[in-house]
Amino acid sequence: KEITNALETWGALGQDINLDIPSFQMSDDIDDIKWEKTSDKKKIAQFRKEKETFKEKDTYKLFKNGTLKIKHLKTDDQDIYKVSIYDTKGKNVLEKIFDLKIQERVSKPKISWTCINTTLTCEVMNGTDPELNLYQDGKHLKLSQRVITHKWTTSLSAKFKCTAGNKVSKESSVEPVSCPEKGLD
């Protein structure tokens, strides 16, 4: 019997996720695969030989290889999930625990600038805990959370790239910024 620590798993709000059982191969010896959501100690899906597959609701799908799909992730899907696998003799051959954490995907960052005081802002409106990275002509300038403000002093024309990322997504915007010599918006 193998009991391991939780597998840290990240899913995106509103999207599907597959909880794949690592190092598990389905075979004729397997009689029972049971998935539980541990917060309410409730069985959510179960495969049993010669019986119809059980699923607590339609957002769950259990594949033949034991993988659990959760459709259209919601915030209350964030939980600890446990899968227990038994052979035909009733022996618990595998147990895995998944710590499912959910984040909202980041939106595409918005780059805006003013030529008057050569200030550029990159901002991301949506997403859980986004980190922003700003680049000028390929060189990394700075990183921040949610908003970056940068005052540039060198060339009046440059290509800026801003990347927003969190554990479930990543989005980038590129803007060629060009300002007249005298600096007008």
Epitope: N5, L7, E8, T9, P130, H140, L143, T163, G165, K167
Partner: antibody, heavy 120, light 107 residues
Framework: QVQLQQPGTELVRPGSSVKLSCKAS????????VNWVKQRPDQGLEWIGR????????HYNQKFTDKAISTIDTSSNTAYMQLSTLTSDASAVYYC?????????????WGQGTLVTVSS | DIVMTQSPATLSVTPGDRVSLSCRAS??????LHWYQQKSHESPRLLIK???QSISGIPSRFSGSGSGSDFTLSINSVEPEDVGVYYC?????????FGAGTKLELR
């Protein structure tokens, strides 16, 4: 249960190259950058660069731009770093570490390191 | 590149002591400063992130403070297992850079 597995040692000839591996398990591979850090015997830590398994974006320390190339194999959850044209000062322990994409500069977990010895 | 300077280079302590390790950045890095511990023949491990944020599994005797360019790692009652080298790291801009380390040893 997060694990970053690295081979223990690599013995290489001067002028040749070596490809170091780092196999990740216990977490969502595409949610974290994989960083590479060099440590020469009884010396400090030197950041070489990093790669994002989500889209293979890379950042390098300029000092290693012509020396190191990072790649990813998402099918096996493995990161690689190729070091080329090796000289004796490349003899060091090379660590891989992971950093979360939403707070990407803290190196949260580390592999055991691969000792690279450059010798003829 | 941002240069990180740590002091002292070596610190000799007695178990139970409260100790402070200093780290200075060559320019302001806000709170983008991370601390690592490396014991002999082991990999480094993250102790404190963003100057003062604690890490799950790290004993509460470790704490961090500071912002801008001056930072401190404190151990409020040193245990024998705390022996090792402590590194601070700039997490503000690339390349990520580390201090040369402070070696903590038992007197």
């Amino acid at each position: 249960q997060v694990q970053l597995q690295q081979p223990g040692t690599e013995l290489v000839r001067p002028g040749s190259s070596v490809k170091l591996s780092c196999k990740a398990s216990g977490y969502t591979f595409t949610s974290y950058w994989v960083n590479w850090v060099k440590q020469r015997p009884d010396q400090g830590l030197e950041w070489i660069g990093r790669i994002d398994p989500y889209d293979s974006e890379t950042h390098y320390n300029q000092k290693f731009t012509d020396k190191a190339i990072s790649t990813i194999d998402t099918s096996s959850n493995t990161a690689y770093m190729q070091l080329s044209t090796l000289t004796s000062d490349a003899s060091a322990v090379y660590y891989c570490s992971r950093s979360p994409r939403d707070s990407s500069t803290n190196l949260a977990d580390w592999g055991q390191g691969t000792l690279v010895t450059v010798s003829s | 590149d941002i240069v990180m300077t740590q002091s002292p280079a070596t610190l000799s302590v007695t178990p139970g002591d409260r100790v402070s390790l200093s780290c200075r950045a060559s320019q302001s890095i806000s709170d983008y400063l991370h601390w690592y511990q490396q014991k002999s023949h082991e990999s480094p491990r993250l102790l404190i992130k963003y100057a003062s944020q604690s890490i799950s599994g790290i004993p509460s005797r470790f704490s961090g403070s500071g912002s801008g360019s001056d930072f401190t790692l404190s151990i409020n009652s040193v245990e024998p297992e705390d022996v090792g080298v402590y590194y601070c790291q700039n997490g503000h801009s690339f390349p990520l850079t580390f201090g040369a380390g402070t070696k903590l040893e038992l007197r």
